[in-house]
Interface confidence: low
């Protein structure tokens, strides 16, 4: 606000006042009179730029008169008091109330003094974010959606991600006249590495004290990615039994594990136990390639591992496996 004047009366008011759609708002307006200055206020007047006539008048002897009595009210002005406070309350803010207003004091002997106030009509948006569940498309697709509904002015949406990708943002009229719904999609090429990771939608709006952060956990459906572990190339005869593990990553979870060899079914010394294959001790060298086939709702994938059980006992009889 401008500082009080030192030699003249000054009308004090903020240059801009925000108000929310449907709510009430006060347009503050005060007459600053220096200590020694004598002045007499005969009338307070509010008008809107571009419109003829006054929307609110408070006359020193006749009191208030409003263009819309149910929507306007002088906050502090009263008959029989010094008219120093012209603050006006507006009820049920509408989009069309946004604009420039003039607050005017008619004083004697100084004449008229006025100030302009810009009323901004805001609407606080509601924000939501949701995952867009996808499969491995091989091309960029939306994986997350962030919607800011019913903002005025439109909310600003940005994304924060360590996964790469790019936003696609659009606007549409909000349900209430003058409001805007902003929809932003986060688009990337889905991969198994993306599944379970998160991106954050940041919504900024001048009605918010601080930006709203909405985190979305991504979902990418993909067939199993399979590997076999548990063999260290140092398996020997006469050792304890060992275990191979079929390691599978997939979404949705694997529904089945099937062990076999390149020659067909499992040999007698190999026993399948779900994701694990138990290798019992053998009495002669073997060279076998094991296959683990993993199935989920999107398909089946397999991994192969060649196991050699060699002659020559290890230094410690601790088992064929280093596990």
């Amino acid at each position: 606000w401008p500082p009080p004047g030192t030699g003249d009366i000054i009308v004090q008011a903020p240059t801009q006042v925000p108000g929310f759609l449907g709510d009430s708002v006060t347009l503050p307006c005060y007459l600053q009179v220096p200590g020694m200055e004598e002045t007499h206020v005969s009338q307070l007047t509010w008008s809107r730029h571009g419109e003829s006539g006054s929307m609110a008048v408070f006359h020193q002897t006749q009191g208030p008169n409003y263009s819309e009595p149910k929507r306007l009210e002088f906050v502090a002005a009263r008959l029989g008091t010094e008219l120093r406070d012209a603050s006006l309350r507006m009820f049920g803010l509408r989009v069309e109330d946004e604009g420039n207003y003039t607050c005017l004091f008619v004083t004697f002997p100084q004449g008229s003094r006025s100030v302009d106030i810009w009323l901004r009509v805001l609407a606080k948006p509601q924000n939501t974010a949701e995952v867009q569940k996808v499969q491995l498309t091989g091309k960029p697709v939306p994986v997350a959606r962030c919607v800011s509904t019913g903002g005025r002015p439109p909310a600003h949406i940005t994304w924060h991600s360590d996964l790469g990708g790019m936003p696609n943002t659009s606007q549409a009229p909000g349900f209430l006249s003058g409001t805007v719904t902003v929809t932003s999609l986060w688009i990337l090429v889905p991969s198994s590495q993306v599944d379970g990771k998160s991106v954050t939608c940041k919504v900024e709006h001048e009605s918010f004290e601080k930006p709203q952060l909405l985190t979305v956990n991504l979902t990418v459906y993909y067939p199993p990615e399979v590997s076999i572990s548990g063999y260290d190339n140092n398996w020997y005869l006469s050792q304890n039994e060992a275990t191979l593990t079929c390691d599978a990553r997939s979404n949705p979870e694997p529904t089945g594990y099937n062990w076999s060899t390149t020659m067909g079914p499992l040999p007698p010394f190999a026993v399948a136990q779900g994701a694990q294959l138990l290798i019992r001790p053998v009495d002669k060298p073997i060279n076998t390639t094991f296959i683990c086939n993993v199935t989920n709702a999107l398909g089946a994938r397999q991994a192969e591992l060649t196991v050699q059980v060699k002659e020559g006992p290890p230094s410690e009889p601790s088992g064929m496996s280093s596990n």
């Epitope: 759609l21 509408r94 349900f175 719904t181």
Partner: antibody, heavy 121, light 109 residues
Framework: QVQLVQSGAEVKKPGASVKVSCKAS????????ISWVRQAPGQGLEWIAW????????NYNQKFTGRVTMTTDTSTSTAYMELRSLRSDDTAVYYC??????????????WGQGTTVTVSS | QAVVTQEPSLTVSPGGTVTLTCRSS?????????ANWVQQKPGQAFRGLIG???NRAPGVPARFSGSLLGDKAALTLSGAQPEDEAEYYC?????????FGGGTKLTVL
Amino acid sequence: QVQLVQSGAEVKKPGASVKVSCKASGYTFTSSYISWVRQAPGQGLEWIAWIYAGTGDTNYNQKFTGRVTMTTDTSTSTAYMELRSLRSDDTAVYYCARHGYTGRGWYFAVWGQGTTVTVSS
Amino acid sequence: QAVVTQEPSLTVSPGGTVTLTCRSSTGAVTTSNLANWVQQKPGQAFRGLIGHTNNRAPGVPARFSGSLLGDKAALTLSGAQPEDEAEYYCALWYSNKFVFGGGTKLTVL
């Protein structure tokens, strides 16, 4: 002239689902809001939800959340309302209504002819 | 849960004036409630008359007007015609949903 033509009457068993269609013509479908409203026998109107055809953005009456899904097919200018887990008290005439714009706000402008859904075992 | 109440029935003479009202159980109706008025004639489709409290839909005769009357929304019919005999529903918006009133059966006789 603006028209909304709805699909024909349906008879369903409790627990089933129903999908009602509403084909629009005579205006730009993607720049419109469509509400779904129902009227049970001898009762007043009950608002179910609205959808913005351009983006598919929806707003559901909480009473129906989880049971109703609204969609649009912009290629055919058709709106759909699917209601699941039907109960006998879902028996009603279901209407789609396009909202018009007056410059100040929206109003229920043009209505479909209604689709009677009967839920009975 | 908001409840919207209308007069169950009203009668008006041809050429007369009648006001239908719409009350909210949550308090005074304001412009934020976006009061809508819808007409249903027997055997015909619904027709939107008024939106946003007082905005007449295109093609609606000027004898229909919407307003706020005290703490209620109102639909005033000035110079009633026989063809205005119908059921009239109001709908109010409560932040995230519309709630319809039970309807007023208007008889012109």
